[in-house]
Each structure stands twice: as C-alpha cells, then as structure tokens.
Interface confidence: low
C-alpha cells in the first residue's frame, strides 16, 4: 500500500561533508517497526546509501560502517549523512516501509537534492 | 520588447566563495550596446548585485568595487560573483537589456540558485 513521504527539496552539506534532513511519513496506522532506506539517484542510476530498521520510540540503528546516523520522533526521521564529497552531490531519496504490524506500507519521497562542495585544503603550517 | 534569457537553475559556489554561470540571451537583432544586471532574490526581496554595460566584442566592465566580473562571447555572458558567504545563498537573476541601436529589448532569466557554504576555519599554524 502506498504512503506519502515528505522530505526537503534541497539541502547543503556542510564544509565538513555532513548533510542532515528530515524524512516525514504519513502513517496510515500505528506501526511499531519501521524501515528507512536512503537511496541516491545520480545520472539515472539509483544506489542504496544506507538503511535502518527501528522500533518506534527507539533509536535508529544503522550498520557500524554506515555513513548515516539518525533519530526518530513520531512519524519523523532525522537523517544525517556524513563523509560526503563533491562527487556525492545528487538526489537522496527517502524510502519508508511500515514493516509491522501488517499491512505493509511503502512510501517513497521525491528526494532531497544534496549539494556538496569540497573544501579548499588548508595551507601547510610551517 | 521581451527577449528570452537562459541561465542555469543551480550553481554551487566554490569553498572560496566564487560562483560562475553563463547568461545567454536570444538577440532579436545586432545589438552593439548591451547592459547586464545581476539581481538577487531572497525572502521575496530583490536587490541589485552588480551591473555592467558593454559594447559587443569588448570586455564587460563592472565598477571597481563590484563583486562581479565577466566576459562576453556572442550572445553569452560569463558571469563570476566573488566574496560570497553562506548568507548570500539565494536566487541570482540575470537581466539583459539591448540598449543600442533601437528598438530596446529587455530579457529577464528565471534565476540561478547559488548555494554557498562557509568553509571551516583552518587550524591555527603554530
């Protein structure tokens, strides 16, 4: 079943390569188990950036080597992606699945365009 | 008379606060004197950033204290805006006027969203 997911149109990564945005879903029911997946679309290729399943009211747990971290609050997921470089600029799509209890719901946002600018190297200290 | 002006939708300023974009106009005739104005729209306020009048085939000359520089080639103007900070993020609109010979033509682009990220300060050198 389809579900509406909202996310900001544009976000700028910080000069440290960190971008944060909120992914909000219109929950049709009281889900206790939610999975959030971040997909990156660039040059018509879609790749998965990270994914986490969480019990509502608990923290999101991404894999240890994930570039994502996040927190949840009600129907909002606050996502942070780290280690971004200019080449990572692209459309980051938030996919939300209400896994439990049934029925299963799927929602896909329109994407957040994340812009990343590589910093200038600092001059060597003498 | 109205004239079509094209400019990119989005440009990222470099970490040094420099943003460049091309403003192209569909000249209905052979203008010898062209005026280019860059306007910034943010929070529904429109302010003038810089302006230059040039003879086709010659360099654009902005005022000495201007944050803009530029070159022209045919119906294209290559604009560079310097000294940008994160607070300068906004929509930069290219306005082109064909001043001479008559008839006068005016064209306004849809704007280029320039995103600016302030760099992290470099660590103090000991």
């Amino acid at each position: 079943k389809a579900m509406h997911v909202a996310q900001p149109a544009v976000v700028l990564a910080s000069s440290r390569g960190i971008a944060s945005f909120v992914c909000e879903y219109a929950s049709p029911g009281k889900a206790t188990e939610v999975r959030v997946t971040v997909l990156r679309q660039a040059d018509s290729q879609v790749t998965e950036v990270c994914a986490a399943t969480y019990m509502t009211g608990n923290e999101l747990t991404f894999l240890d080597d994930s570039i994502c971290t996040g927190t949840s609050s009600g129907n909002q997921v606050n996502l942070t992606i780290q280690g971004l470089r200019a080449m990572d600029t692209g459309l980051y799509i938030c996919k939300v699945e209400l896994m439990y209890p049934p029925p299963y719901y799927l929602g896909i946002g329109n994407g957040t365009q994340i812009y990343v600018i590589d910093p200038e190297p600092c001059p060597d200290s003498d | 008379k109205a004239m079509h002006v094209a400019q990119p939708a989005v440009v990222l300023a470099s970490s040094r606060g420099i943003a460049s974009f091309v403003c192209e106009y569909a000249s209905p005739g052979k203008a010898t004197e062209v005026r280019v104005t860059v306007l910034r729209q943010a929070d529904s306020q429109v302010t003038e950033v810089c302006a230059a009048t040039y003879m086709t085939g010659n360099e654009l000359t902005f005022l000495d204290d201007s944050i803009c520089t530029g070159t022209s080639s045919g119906n294209q103007v290559n604009l560079t805006i310097q000294g940008l900070r994160a607070m300068d993020t906004g929509l930069y609109i290219c306005k082109v006027e064909l001043m001479y010979p008559p008839p006068y033509y005016l064209g306004i682009g849809n704007g280029t969203q320039i995103y600016v990220i302030d760099p992290e300060p470099c660590p103090d050198s000991d």
């Epitope: 998965e48 399943t53 019990m55 699945e97 209890p101 049934p102 029925p103 299963y104 | -």
Partner: antibody
Framework: QVQLVQSGAEVKKPGSSVKVSCKAS????????MHWVRQAPGQGLEWIGV????????TYNQKFKGRATLTADKSTSTAYMELSSLRSEDTAVYYC????????????????WGQGTLVTVSS | DIQMTQSPSSLSASVGDRVTITCRAS??????LAWYQQKPGKAPKLLVY???TLGDGVPSRFSGSGSGTDYTLTISSLQPEDFATYYC?????????FGGGTKVEIK
C-alpha cells in the same frame, strides 16, 4: 509446546474455492504473525501472505491478491487461508507458519510450521 | 520483487564432506535472510536467521555468512540426517521470496 495443526487434504474442482485452517496452541496467538506459504509438487516454496491476528492487518503477495483471503479467529486461535477461482496450478501443499518473536529488528523468520495441507485441483 | 537465486540446484556429497550452498539476491537484502531445511513430506525447518544466527537446537556444523546480495550456508561436516533440500528466504521487502532450493543427495 508450540503447535500449528492444519486441516486435512482437500480435492477441489477448477473454479471452486478451498479454505484451509491452522489451529495454534502453546503460545499467545495474538503475539505473532501467521504467514501462509505453498509448495507445488516437486517445486520450491512460495509466500502467499501474512495476517496479524491482533489487528486483522494483512499483507498479500500481489500474485495472490484478489484470490487469497486470510482471516484469523482470536477466540479459537485459528487462522484461515481461503483461495478462490482454483486452477490446476494451485495444486500444492499449503503451510501456515508463525513468524518468530521480534527479539531483534532482523528476526523476520518463520520458526514454527504446520504439517501442511495438500490441496489437489482436478476436474 | 526481489529474486533469490540459489546454487547449485543439487549436489552429491558424502558423509563428512564440507558443503557450501549460495544464495544471491537481486538487490541488497541487508542480512534479512533465513535458511531452511526440508525433508520429503515434511514442513521446512528453520536453520539460520539474520544471515548468520543459528536457530534453536540447530547443530553447530551449520553456519551462515554473507552480506549485501550474496549469502552462504555451510555444513562443515555432512551427517546422514543432513541429506535434504535447503532453501533461503529474504525478508527485506514483500513479497518475501524463497530461493529455488538446493537438494543435497548422497554420493
């Protein structure tokens, strides 16, 4: 101990319907999902759908949507799977299976299974 | 739908052999994978979940590994009771599909 006991074998005509039951015991029926899986003779396993007995919420495999109906009776701790408009390719063993306790977020597993119900569709 | 491709479809082995069965998903399933053993006329039995966690009462000769799209079930020393058909299943997004099965036969 946990048990899932299914109804007996059925022989059905093409175009008819069959309703298979699965009686659960040894655990709290409403604490676990009930999934349905089928296996055609000599073939692999195919997931049909899942019902949450507590809420009645259902997720179907799109392949079976419109033909399969999952229900659950909390008072008797029994789950049902009805399949309509039967055709010969629906001949299979139909299993009910409980989804394991959600001890971890990854624990999407079917830990206990019924003995299976053979449904034969033949004219 | 996510396709689960199991290989080999069948294999012959002897008691004591090390047996490896692989399962490849058509997309990343993030360890949301279970392995089952099925003997003729019986219901499947859970062996492994979370790609590598053994089910209750499953002998330690069984192990699961893998990540992303590629997963493996290993039987370190095949026993007579291990001759059966093995299935993988993902739980990443519905429908939760199974692999085609691997039949382990006596050589």
């Amino acid at each position: 101990q946990v048990q899932l006991v299914q109804s007996g074998a059925e022989v059905k005509k093409p175009g008819s319907s069959v309703k298979v039951s699965c009686k659960a015991s040894g655990y709290t029926f409403t604490d676990y999902e009930m999934h349905w899986v089928r296996q055609a003779p000599g073939q692999g396993l195919e997931w049909i759908g899942v019902i949450d007995p507590e809420t009645g919420g259902i997720t179907y495999n799109q392949k079976f949507k419109g033909r399969a109906t999952l229900t659950a009776d909390k008072s008797t701790s029994t789950a049902y799977m009805e399949l309509s408009s039967l055709r010969s390719e629906d001949t299979a063993v139909y299993y009910c299976t409980r989804r394991g306790a959600r001890a971890t977020v990854y624990n999407y597993v079917m830990d206990y299974w019924g003995q299976g119900t053979l449904v034969t569709v033949s004219s | 739908d996510i396709q689960m491709t199991q290989s080999p479809s069948s294999l012959s082995a002897s008691v004591g052999d090390r047996v490896t069965i692989t399962c490849r998903a058509s997309e990343n399933i993030h360890n949301y994978l279970a392995w089952y053993q099925q003997k003729p006329g019986k219901a499947p039995k859970l062996l492994v979940y979370n790609a590598k966690t053994l089910g209750d009462g499953v002998p330690s000769r069984f192990s699961g590994s893998g990540s992303g799209t590629d997963y493996t079930l290993t039987i370190s020393s095949l026993q007579p009771e291990d001759f059966a058909t093995y299935y993988c299943q993902h739980f990443w997004s519905t429908p939760w599909t199974f692999g085609g099965g691997t039949k382990v036969e006596i050589k």
